[in-house]
Interface confidence: medium
């Protein structure tokens, strides 16, 4: 233990100017003071000061007040330091002397005269209050005040626990008043040395090095590390744990980076046209009349529509197009007509009826004819009526569709699901597709239709066709073709056209 | 809250004696931690200390003013007291009270709102 | 009889420090108490034994007393703050304020 007893007078009087032998001091007494501090005794005895003792310079004459906190070369407060464990008694003696010698050192000098004396005795806690007293006899009296405070770095009611503050590597502390350690903003601990991370820092995936850090573990990234990294050159893939890349709707491959709804995503087919999705970065186009080119950019001749009616013939010009009428028609189109039904108008077996007071007329045409004289066979595919790319052809008086594979139905709008005879073994998953099946095949099971066993290095027979390159490890016994563009297939084997299920699992 | 008022009148003569009494409240006059003291200020200009006493009747005097001034302390009514004689115009000033800490360099932490007295004839 | 020198006047842009000493021979030795006064009201207790803040004081005021000088340092000085201050020691048994200094906040 460590710490100090304090001792400030404060004022003295000695209005007479009287020695403790009854004798006057000439020409006054000449004031200064010994104070012996040492264990508590019921009784005060002569001995060593054992908790210490000191002396004051001249204080003042006769009667005075001790305002300056040094004094020539006292102190005020007396400090009586000790380096032992408060007991919280103690036993005070405070004598006043009068000198005629020397002001700084009475001590010193000879012929030194007692004024008076006290004695204290008794309890005192260590702490910051001052505890103020004074005492009379019957020529003097004596104002001071008294406490007990521990040296730096001690701590506690005996002044007994050591505690240094710090703020390094070792702890980032205060000292309570107990000499407990209140750790510093930021930092935990029993010895405040593990930082406080910043605030929602992931436990797992997160750590830091001081506070109000977050520095993420390998595989995580963001401001409080709890975003996974995806696997280096993930393009259009996200991921749940480190170095995964499940891939976005509409993308494949290994990284997916394969477009498999390039229609969406670059908008290839213009003027309208309609985008069909045909395999990773494969497309085609189905134009609108008018339009044709491979992204129906081109725009047809204006007469290609056929826009003169009543057998005029078409001339294209440089916005637009002009109708040259046969006698008898006028009108942008050729669509007015000067002939009546006298003038037997109506082709193919069509009836006339006149209108407008035999001014015009109208044809009513057989079956299988159209136009306003009935000079047009009726062509039943210009209605577009197959659907899912169904081809449409006229057959006599009526039009078929010829569905392409998974599709059925007068108009193609049936889907036929290949995945109904269950045709991938050993528990392969099966994907409709345009074109027919595709399996994804279970660890240690390879092939079209997953019927080939894997007993050896996935890798190693070379199963990656046109320059595609293999990968194993990434589930026991699997490999994955990762295709070189223009190629599609768990191996690679297909050019654009057959559209896959991404990625390819052999 | 300890709260100090200064009481008297606002107007002296010259030649007579200024009498000016202080009443404390909300603490005793009587604790040995406090010496009680008075401080004046002319118009425009800085503070000036006059003396104090302890609550036991000792007193302590500005040198400059010593002939001239008595501080008392009555410890029943709580209250003490200033008397400056034959005072001039050089002594017009707002006169305050305060309480002295005992300890040292304690300051004075409570005055009172101040009284101006004014010497004249 | 013992004197307590300051400088009649310190001015100072809000939020800058303001620096005012107090001269006195080894003041250092004694204990420094400085006081302020706004216009028309009682001082107030701003430092204590040369360096201690009383209750209800802010952390912008403080003070340092060796050799011979006293200082009271005003950092990030306010508006409010404008007003006289006086610094005062014991010189034995006799009270010694200092004549005062203006502080003027720009």
């Known amino acids: 233990g460590s710490g100090i007893f304090q001792l400030r007078l404060q004022e003295f009087v000695n209005q007479r100017g009287m020695l403790a032998n009854g004798q006057s001091c000439e020409p006054g007494c000449r004031t200064f003071f010994r104070i012996c501090l040492k264990h508590f005794q019921a009784t005060f005895s002569e001995g060593p000061c054992t908790f210490g003792n000191v002396s004051t310079p001249v204080l003042g004459t006769n009667s005075f007040v001790v305002r300056d906190k040094n004094s020539g070369s006292g102190r005020n407060p007396l400090q009586l330091p000790f380096n032992f464990t408060w007991p919280g008694t103690f036993s005070l003696n405070i004598q006043a002397w009068h000198t005629p010698g020397d002001d700084l050192r009475p001590e010193t000098s000879p012929g030194n005269s007692l004024i008076s004396q006290i004695i204290i005795q008794g309890s005192l806690a260590v702490g910051k209050i001052w505890r103020t007293d004074e005492q009379n006899d019957t020529l003097t009296r004596l104002s001071y005040s008294y406490r007990v405070i521990c040296s730096d770095n001690y701590y506690g009611e005996s002044c007994s626990r050591l505690c240094k503050k710090r703020d390094d590597h070792f702890g980032h502390y205060e000292c309570q008043p107990d000499g407990s350690l209140s750790c510093l903003p930021g930092w935990t601990g029993k010895y405040c040395d593990q930082p406080i991370c910043l605030s929602g820092c992931h436990e797992q995936n997160g750590y830091c090095s001081k506070p109000d850090e977050c520095i993420c573990r390998p595989g995580w990234q963001g401001r409080l590390c709890n975003e996974c990294i995806p696997h280096n050159g993930c393009r259009h893939g996200t991921c749940s744990i480190p170095w995964q890349c499940a891939c976005d709707e509409g993308w494949g491959g290994l990284f997916c980076d394969q477009d498999l709804n390039y229609c969406t995503h670059h908008s290839p087919c213009k003027n309208g046209s309609t985008c069909s999705n045909s395999g990773p970065k494969g497309y085609t186009c189905t134009c609108l009349p008018g339009y044709t080119g491979e992204h129906c950019e081109l725009g047809l001749s204006k007469c290609a529509s056929n826009p003169c009616r009543n057998g005029g013939s078409c001339k294209d010009q440089e916005n637009s197009y002009h109708c040259l009428c046969p006698p008898g028609y006028y009108g942008q189109h050729c669509e007015h007509s000067t002939l009546t039904c006298a003038d037997s108008p109506c082709f193919n077996g069509g009836s006339c009826r006149e209108r407008n007071q035999g001014s015009s007329y109208a044809c009513e045409c057989p079956p299988n004819f159209t136009g306003s004289n009935c000079e047009k066979k009726v062509d039943r595919c210009t209605s577009n009526p197959c659907a899912n790319g169904g081809q449409c052809q006229n057959r006599g008086p009526s039009r078929t569709c010829r569905c392409r594979p998974g599709f059925t139905g007068t108009h193609c709008e049936l889907h036929i699901s290949d995945c109904a005879r269950s045709p991938c073994a050993h528990g392969g998953t099966c994907h409709d597709l345009e074109n027919g099946p595709v399996c994804t095949c279970p660890a240690g099971f390879s092939g079209r239709r997953c019927e080939v066993r894997i007993t050896h290095d996935a890798c190693a027979s070379g199963p990656c066709f046109n320059g595609a390159t293999c990968y194993t490890g990434l589930s026991p016994n699997n490999f994955v073709c990762n295709c070189p563009y223009g190629f599609v297939g768990s191996r690679c084997e297909f050019p654009v056209g057959l559209p896959p299920s991404f990625p390819w699992v052999a | 809250e300890v709260q100090l008022q200064e009481s008297g009148p606002g107007l002296v003569k010259p030649s007579e004696t200024l009498s000016l009494t202080c009443t404390v409240s909300?603490?005793?006059?009587?604790?040995?931690?406090?010496?009680w003291g008075w401080i004046r200020q002319p118009p425009g200009k800085g503070l000036e200390w006059i003396g104090d006493i302890y609550y036991t009747g000792s007193t302590y005097y500005n040198p400059s003013l010593k002939s001239r001034v008595t501080i008392s302390v009555d410890t029943s009514k709580n209250q003490f007291s200033l008397k400056l004689s034959s005072v001039t115009a050089a002594d017009t000033a707002v006169y305050y009270c305060?309480?002295?800490?005992?300890?040292?360099?304690?300051?004075?932490?409570?005055w009172g709102q101040g009284t101006l007295v004014t010497v004249s004839s | 009889s013992y004197e307590l020198t300051q400088p009649p006047s310190v001015s100072v842009s809000p939020g800058q420090t303001a620096s005012i000493t107090c001269s006195g021979q080894r003041l250092g030795d004694k204990y420094a108490s400085w006081y302020q006064q706004k216009p028309g009201q009682s001082p107030v207790l701003v430092i204590y034994?040369?360096?201690k803040r009383p209750s209800g004081i802010p952390e912008r005021f403080s003070g340092s007393n060796s050799g011979d000088t006293a200082t009271l340092t005003i950092s990030g000085t306010q508006p409010m703050d404008e007003a006289d201050y006086y610094c005062?020691?014991?010189?034995?048994?006799?009270?010694?304020f200092g004549y005062g200094t203006k502080v003027t906040v720009l």
């Open positions: 005062q020691a014991w010189d034995r048994d006799t009270g010694v």
């Open positions: 305060a309480r002295e800490e005992a300890i040292l360099g304690g300051g004075s932490d409570y």
């Open positions: 034994e040369d360096s």
């Open positions: 909300g603490g005793s006059i009587s604790s040995s931690s406090y010496y």
